[in-house]
């Protein structure tokens, strides 16, 4: 494979949220195209995104086969169109990515509050379980299925009339909290993997949801479901 006029990719970067995983790189191609290969440490190199003029490649299908494996990718550069033929048979230039372990490194997507319901002085807040592209026995798994008890949610809640926040934690997708009678509350949740010690330990906060807004009043004896 001749390599005339081709430059190796650089700045290979993994972008991954809830296991949706894209490899990005530079430069924008001029008279060249790319093919990406991905491998586990012990596995073989599998080509993806053949002869692409893009500078990104969706590798989700490969990494979801085993999210606890460590993956390495490499990007090959090939000349596109007419180039001066040197008769060279050297290997095409390529660049390796950093290693990537999806289970440890995928970012946690912004969670969503699925519903809340009040009964007396208790409110049950339910976090929507996000689906991932990870499969088991031909069934897509949720974020909770994949992470199990490694994943917790932190609930931030406060009276609509004040700014003092309280917090609660759960290793399921539900919170049951005590509230003051006759008060409206606002809620926001955050996904957290406490065992991680890196910047991707926490998700961004969910959108804020408040009792008594838009969808009707939440009565002490009634139910208020907030669906998205």
């Amino acid at each position: 494979s001749g390599t005339t006029n081709t430059v190796a990719a650089y700045n290979l970067t993994w972008k991954s949220t809830n296991f949706k995983t894209i490899l990005e790189w530079e430069p924008k191609p001029i008279n060249q195209v790319y093919t990406v290969q991905i491998s586990t440490k012990s596995g073989d190199w599998k080509s993806k995104c053949f002869y692409t003029a893009d500078t990104e490649c969706d590798l989700t299908d490969e990494i979801v086969k085993d999210v606890k494996q460590t993956y390495l990718a490499r990007v090959f550069s090939y000349p596109a169109g007419h180039v001066e033929s040197t008769g060279s048979t050297e290997e095409p230039p390529y660049e390796n990515s950093p290693e990537f372990t999806p289970y440890l490194e995928t970012n946690l997507g912004q969670p969503t509050i699925q519903s809340f319901e009040q009964v007396g002085t208790k409110v049950n807040v339910t976090v929507q379980d996000e689906w991932t592209l990870v499969r088991r026995n031909d069934t897509f798994l949720s974020l909770r299925d994949v992470f199990g008890k490694d994943l917790i949610y932190t609930l931030y809640y406060w009276k609509s009339s004040s700014s003092g926040k309280k917090t609660a934690k759960t290793n399921t997708n539900e919170f049951l909290i005590d509230v003051d009678k006759g008060e409206n509350y606002c809620f926001s949740v955050q996904a957290v993997i406490p065992s991680r010690r890196t910047a991707n330990r926490k998700s961004t906060d969910s959108p804020v949801e408040c009792m008594g807004h838009e969808k009707g009043e939440s009565r002490e004896t009634g139910h208020h479901h907030h669906h998205h």
């Epitope: 080509s47 002869y51 596109a80």
Partner: antibody, heavy 121, light 107 residues
Framework: QVQLVQSGAEVKKPGASVKVSCKAS????????MHWVRQAPGQGLEWMGI????????VYAQKFQGRVTMTRDTSTSTVYMELSSLRSEDTAVYYC??????????????WGQGTMVTVSS | DIQMTQSPSSLSASVGDRVTITCQAS??????LNWYQQKPGKAPKLLIY???NLETGVPSRFSGSRSGTDFTFTISSLQPEDIATYYC?????????FGGGTKVEIK
């Protein structure tokens, strides 16, 4: 139905050029790569290169670099393969072949009927 | 370039026989291998893609498997219409390359 129809047989002198066409129908032309594969008489198959019809980007096998040009005309859903500086060993059947879906991007799932190019003085 | 060594180059078998063709890659190509059937005077036809997936409309007597860099193509019960030359093709590395072909004849 999905099909690729190629231009007719050609006889060329050494040093000349030949341009073979391949008209696609029955599918969205821009969505599938097109490849060219040749087969010398009694011999095996040899991949020459690929063209992405949506952007016109081409990649050629090193063996053919500088002699082959692949182009496309999106208005007629046609791809072309031009081979220059012909020599006797270029005598072969030339096939266009569609690259498969994303599932099998570099499997050739639809083939043209082939164009016989004879190079003879 | 990746060399695809196909064997045997030809074989003769009876109708109903199990026929096996092998293709060995000169280096690891993952499962990026396809199998084609070419009848005399005709264009090749895709039978198997990604080493073991049967192309739509292809009879189930055709199958493919992989063990490391060795790939096997099998016709479980040879039929008269299976007389053809069979080719493997790898696409894991540029340029794409084919095996030399196996000509299958009926005894």
């Amino acid at each position: 139905q999905v099909q690729l129809v190629q231009s007719g047989a050609e006889v060329k002198k050494p040093g000349a050029s030949v341009k073979v066409s391949c008209k696609a129908s029955g599918y969205t032309f821009a969505n599938y790569y097109m490849h060219w594969v040749r087969q010398a008489p009694g011999q095996g198959l040899e991949w020459m290169g690929i063209i992405n019809p949506s952007g016109g980007i081409t990649v050629y096998a090193q063996k053919f670099q500088g002699r082959v040009t692949m182009t496309r005309d999106t208005s007629t859903s046609t791809v072309y393969m031009e081979l220059s500086s012909l020599r006797s060993e270029d005598t072969a059947v030339y096939y266009c072949a569609r690259g498969g879906s994303k599932v099998a991007a570099l499997a050739f799932d639809i083939w043209g009927q082939g164009t016989m190019v004879t190079v003879s003085s | 370039d990746i060399q695809m060594t196909q064997s045997p180059s030809s074989l003769s078998a009876s109708v109903g026989d199990r026929v096996t063709i092998t293709c060995q890659a000169s280096q690891d190509i993952s499962n990026s291998l396809n199998w084609y059937q070419q009848k005399p005077g005709k264009a090749p036809k895709l039978l198997i893609y990604d080493a073991s997936n049967l192309e739509t409309g292809v009879p189930s007597r055709f199958s493919g498997s992989r063990s490391g860099t060795d790939f096997t193509f099998t016709i479980s019960s040879l039929q008269p219409e299976d007389i053809a030359t069979y080719y493997c093709q790898q696409y894991n590395f540029h340029p794409l390359t084919f095996g030399g072909g196996t000509k299958v004849e009926i005894k």
